[in-house]
C-alpha cells in the first residue's frame, strides 16, 4: 500500500537562500552542521541531478547504518526537491521505498514554509510503523534547525 504523511514547518530564512543551503548544498552542509545526525554523504552515481544515487551514513549508535537516496527531481526555480529512499534504513521486507517531496515557499515576512510529503510504499498489506514516521520527521527537523542556525550565524553563506 501507499501511506502519505504531510507536514509543514516554518523557517526564518528566505526561501531562495534556504533552498541553496538545505537542498542544493545539503550534502556538504549536513555533516558539518549536524554531525550528531549525519556522519557523511557520498555520491554513488550521478552528478547531483535526477537519477543520482547517494549514500547517507549515520553516526555510531543509530538504529540504521545508512540509507541510499535517489534524486527524482530538482526544480531550482520553484524550490522543489523530490527524492526517494531506496535502500538501507527502514527499507526491507515490509517497506519498498519512501518517496519524499519538499517544497519551500516564500512567506510575506521574508521567511519560508517547508511543505513536506512522505509517501511510504509498503509491500502487500503491511502498514507503516508510527515510530518510523516520527523518527523521519525528527531527523528532518534536526537538519533544518541546524542549517537554519548555521545560516543565522554565517550571514554571507548561501546568499
Amino acid at each position: 500500500g501507499v501511506f502519505n504523511y504531510e507536514t509543514e514547518t516554518t523557517s526564518v530564512i528566505p526561501a531562495a537562500r534556504l533552498f541553496k543551503a538545505f537542498i542544493l548544498d545539503g550534502d556538504n552542509l549536513f555533516p558539518k552542521v549536524a554531525p550528531q545526525a549525519i556522519s557523511s554523504v557520498e555520491n554513488i552515481e550521478g552528478n547531483g541531478g535526477p537519477g543520482t544515487i547517494k549514500k547517507i551514513s549515520f553516526p555510531e549508535g543509530f538504529p540504521f547504518k545508512y540509507v541510499k537516496d535517489r534524486v527524482d527531481e530538482v526544480d531550482h526555480t520553484n524550490f522543489k526537491y523530490n527524492y526517494s529512499v531506496i535502500e538501507g534504513g527502514p527499507i526491507g521486507d515490509t517497506l519498498e521505498k519512501i518517496s519524499n517531496e519538499i517544497k519551500i515557499v516564500a512567506t510575506p515576512d521574508g521567511g519560508s514554509i517547508l511543505k513536506i510529503s512522505n509517501k511510504y510504499h509498503t509491500k502487500g498489506d503491511h502498514e507503516v510503523k508510527a515510530e518510523q514516521v516520527k523518527a523521519s520527521k525528527e531527523m528532518g527537523e534536526t537538519l533544518l534547525r541546524a542549517v537554519e542556525s548555521y545560516l543565522l550565524a554565517h550571514s554571507d553563506a548561501y546568499n
Epitope: 541553496k20 542544493l24 548544498d25 552542509l29 547531483g48 541531478g49 531550482h76 554571507d156 548561501y158
Partner: antibody
C-alpha cells in the same frame, strides 16, 4: 546586500596591460561561476569570459583569447581579469557579474543576478 | 556561436500602457532539463545591467510582477503589462546555453 565592487580600470597605451579586480561582499564567491562582461562606448553588452567556481575551467570570447586571463582567489573572495596586449577595440566599461550556483547537487543557474558597478578601460596613445 | 536578434531596436512607450520586446536565437535554447537558457536584462541610463528574467520565464528576486518572460526554443518575448517611467533603458536578451554567452543588440525603451 550582496555586492560586487570592480576596480583597476584606467588609461593604458595600445599593447599595454591592466589587471581588473572584482571584490565580492555578503556572499561566498566559491559557490558561484563568475563572469566578465564589457560595454564599448555607445555599444551593447558583450560577454568576455567565464570561470568555474573552483577556477578549473575558463572560457573566453574569441577576440580576447590568448590576451586576457580570468582568475579567482576564493580565499580573498575576489575575481580578476588580467588584460595584456590591449587594443583600441578593448576600450569599454568592464563589469563583473555572478553566475550560476554550485553546490553538492551540481550547477544551477539563476541568471547573472549580481553585477559590479563597472570600471572604465581606456586604450589610447 | 549563437546569434541573438531583437525587435524592435527602439520602442517609444506610454506610461500605463503595455509593451513587448521580441528576441530570437539562431538555434534552440531549450535544454534537455526542460529550461530555456535565455535571460532578460535592463540597463537603466548610467547604471549597471540588472537581471529581470532568467531561464526564459523566471522573474528574478525583487523584479516587479509587471515584467514577464515567455517563449521557448528560438522565439522569446518580454512583456511589461503597464509601463512605468522607471522602466526606461535598454533591454537585452542573452543566451547562456553555450558557454560563449551572447547578447542581443538591445532594445531602447523611452517615454513617448
Amino acid at each position: 546586500e550582496v555586492e560586487l565592487v570592480v576596480s583597476g580600470g584606467g588609461l593604458v597605451q595600445p599593447g599595454g596591460s591592466l589587471r581588473l579586480s572584482c571584490a565580492a561582499s555578503r556572499f561566498i564567491l566559491s559557490h558561484y561561476w563568475m563572469t566578465w562582461v564589457r560595454q564599448a562606448p555607445g555599444k551593447g553588452l558583450e560577454w568576455v569570459a567565464n570561470i568555474k567556481q573552483d577556477g578549473r575551467e575558463e572560457y573566453y570570447v574569441d577576440s580576447v583569447k590568448g590576451r586576457f586571463t580570468i582568475s579567482r582567489d576564493n580565499a580573498k573572495n575576489s575575481l580578476y581579469l588580467q588584460m595584456n596586449s590591449l587594443r583600441a577595440e578593448d576600450m569599454a566599461v568592464y563589469y563583473c557579474a555572478r553566475g550560476g550556483f554550485w553546490g553538492a547537487m551540481g550547477y544551477y543557474y539563476y541568471g547573472l543576478d549580481v553585477w559590479g558597478q563597472g570600471t572604465t578601460v581606456t586604450v589610447s596613445s | 556561436d549563437i546569434v541573438m536578434t531583437q525587435s524592435p531596436l527602439s520602442l517609444p512607450v506610454i506610461p500605463g500602457e503595455p509593451a513587448s520586446i521580441s528576441c530570437r536565437s539562431s538555434q534552440s535554447l531549450l535544454q534537455s532539463d526542460g529550461h530555456n537558457y535565455l535571460d532578460w536584462y535592463l540597463q537603466k541610463p548610467g547604471q549597471s545591467p540588472q537581471l529581470l528574467i532568467y531561464l526564459g520565464s523566471n522573474r528574478a528576486s525583487g523584479v516587479p510582477d509587471r515584467f514577464s518572460g515567455s517563449g521557448s526554443g528560438t522565439d522569446f518575448t518580454l512583456k511589461i503589462s503597464r509601463v512605468e517611467a522607471e522602466d526606461v533603458g535598454i533591454y537585452y536578451c542573452m543566451q547562456t546555453l553555450q558557454t560563449g554567452f551572447t547578447f542581443g543588440p538591445g532594445t531602447k525603451v523611452d517615454i513617448k
